[in-house]
Interface confidence: low
């Protein structure tokens, strides 16, 4: 079943999957559709990386983390009811049916009044539990997520930085991250 | 050589805006090698501050909380150019601000820019 | 945010002579942090990263060492061309932040 989340028309939707890459620079494509994931590739792309950069991208759709780290989460800036619905995270590893993916659900209400314009980014939603782990540098281990470098040791003081990270305070225990590699 | 040469001293009048900027040479803005674009400022006499980053090839940006009304960062990758708007102007920020240059997965800064002095003063 | 603490504010030596800066972190933060000098009216030159690892085309009597909360930046042999300011700076979380910085003065 999907993991939902909410945002008022007029705020920004934060819709989070993650991967770890395998080794630092080791990018895996990745692609955001609305609908849900089909066998292969995702229906109506709206944004799409390859192994070194952001090379697709629609109007509104853009990754505010720190996708070079795998934080592959997409915002939707701006959104109105129609925005509603299934969204697709593929994470495309290399290999035959190797992909991971993750169907998200969006449901947008409307606004309780009319938002004025401005420029802080107000995420909503929950920033999902960070599990995985990868080598960095001498000796470090890392989380994965929009902050670099933090430790394991302090998840404990990750909500902090989470309000730095510009996402919800609150932590789940639902989202989309995997190991690669 | 990779360099980013900055843009020239900016002598400002409180309540304004000023555009300063930074081009790269030397290393492909965009190419396979993800590099992002940070920027830093340095009072006069005192230490350096983070305000953010860009990553030109998708226009992505992350701000130091403290800068993100301050400051706008933008690129332009046809002339391997990334700027940096400052509004609504005051005396704290005058200021010396360097960009600088980190490469995907390494975090920290390799490079840094001539530096750009600006001066807010009616 | 993390805090860096520099100290002391200002080292003054004679030339030869080894000298150590401080740099301590209000939290761990492994080995994520960088050294930079920065000679006046220059800008900052990056001069060791992750607490040790050495930089090409930086001179050999520069070193650094620590992890956790304490760090150091040495140099063996002052040299007069090293009178600067030295800041360290963590990667370990957003925002990036730096240490106040410490200023060499030649004796």
């Known amino acids: 079943s999907e993991v939902e989340y909410r945002a008022e028309v007029g705020q920004n939707a934060y819709l989070p999957c993650f991967y770890t890459p395998a080794a630092p620079g080791n990018l895996v494509p990745v692609c955001w559709g609305k609908g849900a994931c089909p066998v292969f590739e995702c229906g109506n792309v709206v944004l799409r990386t390859d192994e070194r950069d952001v090379n697709y991208w629609t109007s509104r759709y853009w990754l505010n983390g720190d996708f070079r780290k795998g934080d592959v989460s997409l915002t939707i800036e701006n959104v109105t009811l129609a925005d509603s619905g299934i969204y697709c995270c593929r994470i495309q590893i290399p290999g035959i049916m190797n992909d991971e993916k993750f169907n998200l659900k969006l449901v947008i209400k409307p606004a309780k009044v009319t938002p004025a314009p401005t420029r802080q980014r107000d995420f909503t939603a929950a920033f999902p539990r960070m599990l995985t782990t990868r080598g960095h540098g001498p000796a470090e281990t890392q989380t994965l997520g929009s902050l670099p470098d933090i430790n394991l040791t302090q998840i404990s003081t990750l909500a902090n930085e989470l309000r730095d990270s510009r996402l919800a305070n609150d932590l789940r225990d639902s989202g989309a991250t995997i190991r690669i590699g | 050589q990779v360099q980013l040469q900055q843009s020239g001293p900016e002598l400002v009048k409180p309540g304004a805006s000023v555009k300063i900027s930074c081009k790269a040479s030397?290393?492909?803005?965009?190419?396979?090698?993800?590099?992002?674009i940070h920027w830093v400022k340095q009072r006069p006499g005192q230490g350096l501050e983070w305000i953010g980053w860009?990553?030109?090839?998708?226009?992505?940006?992350k701000y130091n909380e403290k800068f993100k009304v301050k400051a706008t960062l933008t690129a332009d990758t046809s002339s391997s150019t990334a700027d940096m708007q400052l509004s609504s102007l005051t005396s704290e920020d005058s200021a010396v601000y360097y960009c600088?240059?980190?490469?995907?997965?390494?975090?920290?800064?390799?490079?840094w820019g001539t530096g750009t002095t600006v001066t807010v003063s009616s | 945010d993390i805090l860096l603490t520099q100290s002391p504010a200002i080292l003054s030596v004679s030339p030869g002579e080894r000298v150590s800066f401080s740099c301590r972190a209000s939290?761990?933060?492994?080995?994520?942090i960088h050294w930079f000098q920065q000679r006046t009216n220059g800008s900052p030159r990056l001069l060791i990263k992750?607490?040790?690892e050495s930089i090409s085309g930086i001179p050999s009597r520069f070193s650094g060492s620590g992890s956790g909360t304490d760090f150091t930046l040495s140099i063996n042999s002052v040299e007069s061309e090293d009178i600067a300011d030295y800041y360290c700076?963590?990667?370990?979380?957003?925002?990036?932040?730096f240490g106040g910085g410490t200023k060499l003065e030649i004796k």
């Open positions: 600088a240059r980190e490469a995907w997965g390494n975090w920290y800064f390799d490079v």
């Open positions: 030397g290393y492909s803005f965009t190419g396979y090698y993800i590099h992002y």
């Open positions: 860009i990553y030109p090839g998708s226009g992505n940006t």
């Open positions: 939290q761990s933060i492994g080995t994520s």
């Open positions: 992750y607490a040790s």
């Open positions: 700076q963590q990667s370990n979380s957003w925002p990036y932040t």
